[in-house]
Amino acid sequence: FGISGKHFITVTTFTSAGNIGEDGTLSCTFEPDIKLNGIVIQWLKEGIKGLVHEFKEGKDDLSQQHEMFRGRTAVFADQVVVGNASLRLKNVQLTDAGTYTCYIRTSKGKGNANLEYKTGAFSMPEINV
């Protein structure tokens, strides 16, 4: 199956919206490697230096995380095994809107996909019976 980094892997994202002040999810999936220690997940945001979130070797590595995301991000660690690289974003802010990249590296190769994240004061429509 080739040397690490020489193959492109398929990464899929879904455009989503976040409600200001609530928690949101940026969705990203991939075909998971059975070698979980070889999986690296990085979330980046256009226009921001540093990372939104990094997960590697089975745990978070927030050493390069941008300060605007400090304490507000998490991946679903127990779901990486089934290819879920989605990012949980706590206390969504208006400034969280923008273009995000979900970058995945495995023993087979690497891949990425972008998503547009919209933020606002969305509410469920009232239904009158």
């Epitope: 892997i9 075909e31 998971p32 059975i34 070889g38 089975g58 745990k59 495995t106």
Partner: antibody
Framework: EVQLLESGGGLVQPGGSLRLSCAAS????????MHWVRQAPGKGLEWVAS????????YYADSVKGRFTISRDNSKNTLYLQMNSLRAEDTAVYYC?????????WGQGTTVTVSS | DIQMTQSPSSLSASVGDRVTITCRAS??????LNWYQQKPGKAPKLLIY???NLQSGVPSRFSGSGSGTDFTLTISSLQPEDFATYYC?????????FGQGTKLEIK
């Protein structure tokens, strides 16, 4: 009901071949990685091989590498284990298991006996 | 390869007892550890995944803890149906490896 059903086991002479099948039902088979795990009589569990959801990643235990081949047919919801050059030490109950957060669904097992 | 060592290998206990089984990995596996229960002639059953998460349908008397190299399975109050063999398993990397098993017997 989520179910895995193995078949294809039996008695085979050393050096012989067998193909095990694992039929999946009750879940979206193409979304999950799968494993083969075996258990020799009176012994513990031993991982044999794994395959990811779209067959992009395949791994084998050293003890079977070069002799066994794991594969899957997502259109038939079936996992396979082709076993060649069988040895007495391959005698075991062979289980297929779904790869989720843990091996969360197991088949009932199929017995492979390698003996002359 | 990552070696998984369980202790004890066998254990005698009574209904109602609190039982602890430990599992040690030869190197760090983060929280990528599962616990299984197996009864004679049956397939293993997943109890705990990712070190501490209770699998759906498993009684709450089972719990798991630990990360890195040291892990624990605890049964808070043994029931008659809990007498079985228990295995830990790491899924951090290949080869996937199991502990040798802990046989839990009635005292």
């Amino acid at each position: 009901e989520v179910q895995l059903l193995e078949s294809g086991g039996g008695l085979v002479q050393p050096g012989g071949s067998l193909r095990l099948s694992c039929a999946a039902s009750g879940f979206t088979f193409s979304s999950y990685g799968m494993h083969w795990v075996r258990q020799a009589p009176g012994k513990g569990l031993e991982w044999v091989a794994s395959i990811s959801s779209s067959s992009g990643y395949i791994y084998y235990a050293d003890s079977v590498k070069g002799r066994f081949t794991i594969s899957r047919d997502n259109s038939k919801n079936t996992l396979y284990l082709q076993m060649n050059s069988l040895r007495a030490e391959d005698t075991a109950v062979y289980y297929c298991a779904r790869a989720s957060s843990g091996m969360d669904v197991w088949g009932q097992g199929t017995t492979v006996t390698v003996s002359s | 390869d990552i070696q998984m060592t369980q202790s004890p290998s066998s254990l005698s206990a009574s209904v109602g007892d609190r039982v602890t089984i430990t599992c040690r990995a030869s190197q760090s596996i983060s929280s990528y550890l599962n616990w299984y229960q197996q009864k004679p002639g049956k397939a293993p059953k997943l109890l705990i995944y990712a070190a501490s998460n209770l699998q759906s349908g498993v009684p709450s008397r089972f719990s798991g803890s630990g990360s890195g190299t040291d892990f624990t399975l605890t049964i808070s109050s043994l029931q008659p149906e809990d007498f079985a063999t228990y295995y830990c398993q790491q899924y951090y990397t290949t080869p996937l490896t199991f502990g040798q098993g802990t046989k839990l017997e009635i005292k």
